[in-house]
């Protein structure tokens, strides 16, 4: 089964190569509407240092795989070789949200991006009814990346001070009532990512219709609106509309609840301060330590690494983890050097899968939880890779 | 090629109005962000109001809510800064600009116009 190209087809996306100041905006279906890319540019890159943008692949030339989408032009590498033309190649994994395309390499004929996205999973599980970009670069070409904060049922109860509403959002996406572990929301409308609740019955105030936007370094605008459809009677004949501000804090602190700002003829400003609002490399780092120098916070988890020994095991339902952090590879898991969490099924011991690599490490601290992740792990079932937090 | 053409601006007393328009040629209107900077003499140039595509996201500036409303004819190809109850330190030069996908890094910029507020 090949990717399903339809939830991504409705935005341009960016990516960004930091080292070669470049920027990319793709849309894998179609033209991304920079007029210097041509009337058919699927991915066009411009270089902000001489301001001059190019199309590095065409979706006149467009190929796919089940997991891979290839966009060619008809532009040589360069001037002295006419055989090798200019493309672009996006290699999807299946995600728990649309998640964002990151650029990995490039060579002089080569463009390659890796896609972590409900779009290339085999089953419908994480897919949302309605989802939209949840990120967004500043100016100094730093990601600020909202995804982790996307709930796949449920929602979060915005604070407020009225008793006899309450108000839950969900972020870049709908709200999944009918796997929301608690029954309050299964009687919101499906589609709604903002959902009042009011005596007994559910209004949608909300729906998403554009990604996120940055208004400045620590500042995120999420907007949802209701347009179609009847408008509750205390709306006073107004559309309703939820507008959600992310703020990165000043300084460390533990999460908070998003806020209601002001409310007026159902339309509801809410404030959410949180890290995640903040960029992603003060967030997180790809070895086991965090520097006081960079994400204002020193951790340090290498103690925990393994030397030599044992791994640590984890007793799971269906499965049993044998965990190396930190890694040491002198101990083998899976009988692979590169496994840093391994699984075995507990009724057949021969089913053994990786469910991480060291190389696939990630360290983030941010609203007062650290989380150590691994991914890259074999393939499930679902068409998702293992990722283990 | 693409041109962003701003008009409107000028001279006002304080507590005067001014319509900015911003007309786009050359690209495809409808699909962009269109937003509205300003930079007053020694400052950085920051987002004043912006527009969403759809119009669905529309956000202002905290010292201008109430006093400004951006609008879009995407028939026109066209955005406007309404300007009321203007203050002198809304002096600056006021630049259009349309982002696909950035507010912070637009694809492209007018030349800009220069709004004084002074009696």
């Known amino acids: 089964q090949a990717v399903d190209l339809d939830a991504l087809c409705s935005y341009t996306w960016e990516a960004v190569d930091s080292k070669n100041n470049a920027v990319y905006k793709i849309n894998v279906c179609g033209n991304v509407g920079i007029s210097s890319c041509g009337p058919t540019s699927a991915i066009c890159m411009c270089d902000l240092k001489t301001e001059n943008c190019r199309s590095v692949g065409d979706s006149l030339l467009r190929s796919s795989a089940r997991s891979l989408l290839e966009f060619n032009t008809t532009m040589g590498c360069q001037p002295s070789d006419s055989q090798h033309r200019i493309q672009t190649s996006i290699t999807f994994l299946c995600g728990k949200t649309l998640g964002t395309p990151e650029f990995v390499t490039a060579t002089d004929c080569v463009h390659y991006f890796e896609w972590r996205t409900t779009a290339a999973c085999k089953k419908d599980i994480f897919k949302a009814d309605k989802e939209v970009p949840c990120y967004a670069f500043d100016d100094k070409l730093q990601k600020h990346d909202l995804n982790p904060l996307i709930k796949l049922n449920g929602g979060y109860l915005v604070d407020d001070s009225d008793p006899d509403t309450s108000l839950f959002i969900n972020v870049c996406r709908d709200i999944d009532s009918l796997r929301d572990p608690s029954t309050q929301l299964r009687v919101c409308p499906a589609g709604t990512a903002a959902c009042l609740l009011k005596g007994n019955q559910a209004f949608d105030v909300g729906r998403p219709k554009e990604g996120l936007k940055l208004l400045s370094k620590d500042r995120l605008v999420l907007t949802y609106v209701k347009e179609e459809g009847e408008k509750p009677d205390f709306c006073n004949g107004h559309s309703p509309a939820v507008t959600v501000t992310f703020v990165c804090p000043s300084e460390r602190r533990e999460g908070t609840i998003p806020k209601l700002t002001a409310k007026s003829n159902c339309r509801y400003e809410v404030e959410w301060i949180t890290e995640y609002a903040c960029h992603r490399d003060y967030l997180q780092s790809e070895s086991c330590s965090l520097s006081s120098e960079q994400h204002d916070i020193t951790i340090d988890l290498s103690p925990l690494a393994q030397y030599g020994g044992s791994p640590y095991v984890s007793d799971g339902r269906e499965y049993t983890f044998f965990i190396n952090v930190c890694g040491d590879t002198k101990v083998s898991l899976c009988n692979n050097k590169e496994a840093a969490v391994c699984q075995e099924k507990k009724a057949d011991s021969t089913q053994v899968k990786i469910a991480g690599r060291h190389q696939n490490q990630t360290l983030r601290y941010s609203d007062g939880d650290l989380t150590l992740i691994y991914s890259g792990g074999d393939e499930c079932s679902s068409g998702h890779h293992h990722h283990h937090h | 090629q693409v041109q962003l053409q701003e008009s409107g601006g000028g001279l006002v007393q304080p507590g005067g109005s001014l319509r900015l328009s911003c007309a786009a040629f050359?690209?495809?209107?409808?699909?962009?962000?269109m937003i509205w900077f300003r930079q007053a003499p020694g400052e950085e140039r920051d987002i004043v109001a912006a527009?969403?595509?759809?119009?669905?996201?529309?956000w202002y500036e905290d010292s201008v809510k109430g006093r400004f409303t951006i609008s879009r004819d995407n028939a026109k190809n066209t955005v406007y800064l309404q300007m009321n109850s203007l203050k002198p330190e809304d002096t600056a030069v006021y630049y259009c600009?349309?982002?696909?996908?950035?507010?912070?890094?637009?694809?492209?910029w007018g030349q800009g116009t220069q709004v004084t507020v002074s009696s």
């Open positions: 600009a349309a982002a696909l996908t950035s507010w912070r890094r637009p694809d492209y």
């Open positions: 527009i969403s595509s759809s119009s669905s996201t529309i």
């Open positions: 050359g690209l495809n209107f409808k699909n962009f962000d």
